[in-house]
Amino acid sequence: EEELQVIQPEKSVSVAAGDSATLNCTVSSLIPVGPIQWFRGAGPGRELIYNLKEGHFPRVTPVSDPTKRNNMDFSIRISNITPADAGTYYCVKFRKGSPDVELKSGAGTELSVRAK
């Protein structure tokens, strides 16, 4: 049985330009201790979209649902979507360390942007 599951329930999300996009992610446990980060793309060239501890992400808001009893919600909302935001977004769990160690990624959610 896996110790940690990172679940991105939607394979794809389509949003009109100018609207907001909600990207859902739940994690089965806070243990191991460490942050959740959101990235666009995979591999060494991926772009950090949201990191709670560091950086400034004015268009990104956490929209967790704290009432979820059986898992932890780390969903985000990206406002004022433009075509440049299209891509696949990954919710990634890290284990705290020096530096933090990537443990597990969600399967990814592809964001497509429709014309207004």
Partner: antibody
């Protein structure tokens, strides 16, 4: 019904060792993060140790790190706390607690008393 | 370490009235829009029992006269109306990702 039953407490001299056990039933033990929390009249509740559902990750406060070791046997639905180099300040009631998400302590056992005294 | 300061240390409230307990954290316990603050009830001779998880969520089976509120560093547990069986000591607990996890010193609730 969730049940957590601690055992192994007792009187031990300073510098001695004890092994506490917690027998779990009524839930899927292997899916739960497990912890020990202790309670003393003077210091109230104090988190002692936590282990991930599969046993890979363990966490301790500085007050017990290097002296206490937490382990689990998911096949036996059991949790163990090996306590070495015991000190008078380790005297407390030790509770076993379960947590599905590793956030709050959802269920607690009745506790087992550890007394460290010469 | 994140220090949790509960006030008052003890509280006497008339049956049917409101009891309010405060817990202040030395730094924020919020992560990703969720407050990792929890409340427990402990009656004499018994282990603690979870009442409220993540600041404001009522644990299953807990009467709805218990409620929790707050965010970041300031949290409140409210019992309204107070019943005789609510006589107990109440503890707050934080489980943010900054170890160690800590508890407040407790608030003893009695009947006036």
């Amino acid at each position: 019904e969730v049940q957590l039953v601690e055992s192994g407490g007792g009187l031990v001299k300073p510098g001695g060792s004890l092994r506490l056990s917690c027998a779990a039933s009524g839930f899927t033990f292997s899916s739960y993060v497990m912890s020990w929390v202790r309670q003393t009249p003077g210091k109230g509740l104090e988190w002692v140790a936590t282990i991930s559902s599969g046993g890979t990750y363990t966490y301790y406060p500085s007050s017990v790190k290097g002296r206490f070791t937490l382990s689990r046997d998911n096949a036996k639905n059991s949790l163990y706390l090996q306590m070495n180099s015991l000190r008078a300040e380790d005297t407390a009631v030790y509770y076993c607690a379960s947590s599905l998400t590793g956030s709050s302590f959802d269920y607690w056992g009745q506790g087992t008393t550890v007394t460290v005294s010469s | 370490d994140i220090v949790l300061t509960q006030s008052p240390a003890s509280l006497a409230v008339s049956l049917g009235e409101r009891a309010t307990i405060s817990c202040r954290a030395s730094e924020s316990v919020d992560l990703y829009g969720t407050s990792f603050m929890h409340w427990y009830q402990q009656k004499p001779g018994q282990p603690p029992k979870l009442l409220i998880y993540r600041a404001s969520n009522l644990e299953s089976g807990v009467p709805d006269r218990f409620s929790g509120s707050g965010s970041r560093t300031d949290f409140t547990l409210t019992i309204n109306p107070l019943q005789a069986e609510d006589v107990a000591t109440y503890y707050c607990h934080q489980s943010s990702d900054e170890l160690p996890w800590t508890f407040g010193g407790g608030t003893k609730v009695e009947i006036k």
